[in-house]
């Protein structure tokens, strides 16, 4: 990617000092998607455009960071700037030329799924691995993969083995894992959502 980050930086550098201050204040109260935290007020208010861009991208990733920036700009009445930002990020989304359906492997880097975002916590905290395996068997996991995960001695090593297969999974496969987690350890999913 990178283009979204550049587009955010470009937008923020075009704000006057007063507008940048207003942008930061609005950022403190703008509604956020569930699962995302707020940039701490103390750090935020002292940042210049470059620092703020880096912080937006590290907190919200490029795509949502750009969307959030555009939302705040729009809220400030800077419709044209918001439009330019979104146009710039859409340009860089890796879309195929008009009329050509790009194959999945050349797809733009998709948004981060809950499963990917909380990989480390899931490896450490999932205890009901056998139940997950049964839920995923035949839908997402082959017999060979199922056996390989089951052969691991501990829950964390089982989950690590399971995650070794996820790079090849599409969004719907990850959704099925998340559904299984919600059904078997809903308290854990709830906790991760709040984190």
């Amino acid at each position: 990617m990178g283009r979204a980050r550049d587009a955010i930086l470009d937008a923020l550098e075009n704000l006057t000092a007063e507008e940048l201050k207003k942008f930061k204040l609005k950022l403190l109260s703008v509604p956020l998607r569930e699962g995302y935290g707020r940039i701490p007020r103390g750090a935020l208010l002292s940042m210049d455009a470059l620092d703020l861009t880096d912080k937006l991208v590290s907190f919200y990733l490029e795509t949502y960071g750009a969307e959030l920036t555009a939302n705040v700009l729009r809220d400030m009445g800077l419709q044209e700037m918001a439009g330019q930002l979104q146009a710039a990020t859409h340009q860089g989304s890796g879309a195929a030329p008009a009329g050509i359906q790009a194959p999945p492997q050349s797809a733009a880097k998709p948004g981060l799924h809950f499963i990917d975002q909380h990989r480390a916590a899931l490896i450490a905290r999932v205890t009901n691995v056998e139940w997950l395996l049964d839920a995923l068997y035949g839908k997402v996991l082959t017999d060979e993969q199922y056996q390989a995960v089951r052969a691991e001695p501990t829950n964390p090593s089982k989950m690590r083995k399971l995650f070794s297969f996820t790079p090849a999974w599409n969004w719907t496969c990850k959704d099925l894992l998340l559904q299984a987690l919600r059904e078997s350890q809903s308290y854990l999913v709830e906790d991760l959502e709040r984190s």
């Epitope: 998607r33 569930e34 699962g35 995302y36 795509t63 949502y64 750009a66 969307e67 979104q86 990020t89 859409h90 989304s93 890796g94 194959p103 999945p104 797809a107 733009a108 880097k109 998709p110 948004g111 981060l112 799924h113 809950f114 975002q117 599409n170 969004w171 719907t172 496969c173 990850k174 959704d175 099925l176 998340l178 559904q179 919600r182 059904e183 809903s186 999913v189 709830e190 959502e193």
Partner: antibody, heavy 122, light 107 residues
């Protein structure tokens, strides 16, 4: 502003094929799932399935699996719902919808198309 | 699949009154329930998500509660524009399912 604009009403005969569309604007098309919801005249809502344009994968309600195909064209930010052979029972309003967010796959539909009325009659 | 049963099927009330709509799930769905309003000839509109979260732009007279299998949508004081059909929807597991709807009509 997030917008989902659907293609116009269709009148078809049983056995004919059809592809309806949902054109998306106002956000990055590849970041969110697009869902299709079916509503027969005077009846309730029924989820048909979704597509995730980021990787082209689709999830179907088993009831509709094999009856319809959900697809997307990233180059024009458009999702599709298609039938190869329509039946009279396919007569319904079809809505495309986008969730509030797809991050945790809690699919609350915050954004809706205006609906496409499909009438299948001989 | 998870079946959602809404009650009552029809609710007849007057503007200014309090409306209480119920949604019962056939199995535990934790808090993964949303509520929609639909008026004739219009697409549904999200009111509440995740049982109790008020969607942006929805008036505060709407509120949601519940977890597990029993959920409630409350409209504290009915306005004329609130008379419509209301649907609940679960997001716990696939297929996603909706309730059959409650029609809120003017008495």
């Amino acid at each position: 502003e997030v917008q989902l604009v659907q293609s116009g009403a269709e009148v078809k005969k049983p056995g004919e094929s059809l592809k309806i569309s949902c054109k998306i604007s106002g956000y990055s098309f590849t970041d969110q799932t697009i869902h299709w919801v079916h509503q027969m005249p005077g009846k309730g809502l029924e989820w048909m399935g979704y597509i995730y344009p980021g990787d082209g994968s689709a999830m179907y309600n088993e009831k509709f699996q094999g009856q319809v195909t959900i697809s997307a064209d990233k180059s024009i930010s458009t999702a599709y719902l298609q039938w190869s052979s329509l039946k009279a029972s396919d007569t319904a309003m079809y809505y495309c919808a986008r969730p509030l967010y797809s991050y945790a796959s809690y699919y609350w539909f915050a954004y809706w198309g205006q609906g496409t009325l499909v009438t299948v009659s001989s | 699949e998870i079946v959602l049963t809404q009650s009552p099927a029809t609710l007849s009330l007057s503007p200014g009154e309090r409306a209480t709509l119920s949604c019962h799930a056939s199995q535990n769905i934790n808090v993964y329930l949303s509520w929609y309003q639909q008026k004739p000839g219009q697409a549904p509109r999200l009111l509440i998500y995740k049982s109790s979260n008020l969607h942006t732009g929805i008036p505060a007279r709407f509120s949601g509660s519940g977890s597990g299998t029993d959920f409630t949508l409350t409209i504290s004081s009915l306005e004329p524009e609130d008379f419509a059909v209301y649907y609940c929807q679960q997001g716990q597991s696939y297929p996603l399912t909706f309730g059959q709807g409650t029609k809120l009509e003017i008495k």
